[in-house]
């Protein structure tokens, strides 16, 4: 590939509130299933449609989720983020880094597992 | 865009066995949760079996006999069947969708996935 893919990273509070199936996403990653390389953060990986993180529509495919209502997500298992989320209650505070694919020179290809989402 | 082929279908007698088959496309195969589907004729698709990183989870109808796995390596996951019975004749579907949900999972809504393969034909007589 020529040219070269810069990524612009923008940090963001997202407030969401449980919907009636909760709070309408998935996510990958931890310290034992690294999506994306010598990371072990938790990335979104499907917005569920008309759910809560739809229609609040600021989170993203390829998000990296920071912290869930102050509580690092640095170190932990799948399924302890998993459950950290169920548990997170009714208003849900996601700390959030968006990574913006920033173009340079020719188009490029974005593989599966690449943040950028 | 993850593209699914299912294989192992075919026929049997009452009381036999197959392995049905799911290949996935993608290099992060290991984070999908994988479902399998199942429709008769003048039938609405029902729920089977799932694996997700938490486990397996199976229809009432098919616990005991029905097995769910996955080899991470080939990225694939299979159904073995078991003491297989006329009425689970049908067109097998497998499902996936990319990570675990953040909320109650629900292996049995066919909303929680994303992608579907062709299916393959078992025939119980």
């Known amino acids: 590939m020529n040219g070269r893919v810069d990524y612009l990273v923008t940090e963001e509070e997202i407030n969401l509130t449980r919907g009636p199936s909760g709070l309408g996403f998935n996510i990958v990653g931890g310290t034992d299933q690294q999506y994306v390389s010598n990371d072990s953060g938790i990335y979104v990986s499907r917005i569920k449609e008309n759910g809560a993180a739809a229609l609040d529509g600021r989170l993203q495919e390829g998000d990296k989720i920071l912290s869930v209502n102050g509580q690092d997500l640095k170190n932990l298992l799948h399924q302890d983020a998993v459950d950290l989320f169920r548990n997170a209650g009714y208003a849900v505070s996601l700390r959030v880094q968006h990574r913006l694919q920033v173009q340079n020179g020719p188009i490029g290809h974005r593989g599966e597992g690449d943040p950028s989402g | 865009e993850v593209q699914l082929v299912e294989s192992g279908g075919g026929s049997v007698q009452a009381g036999g066995s197959l392995r049905l088959s799911c290949t996935a496309s993608g290099r992060t195969f290991s984070t999908y949760t994988m479902a399998w589907f199942r429709q008769a004729p003048g039938k609405e698709r029902e729920f089977v079996a799932a694996?997700?990183?938490?486990?397996?989870y199976y229809a009432d109808s098919v616990t005991g006999r029905f097995t769910i796995s996955r080899d991470n390596a080939k990225n694939t996951v299979y159904l073995q069947m078991n003491s297989l019975k006329p009425e689970d004749t049908a067109v097998y579907y497998c499902a996936a969708v990319i990570g675990s949900t953040v909320d109650s999972y629900r292996p049995g809504d066919h909303l929680e996935y994303d992608y579907w393969g062709q299916g393959t034909q078992v025939t119980v007589s």
């Open positions: 694996i997700s990183w938490s486990g397996a």
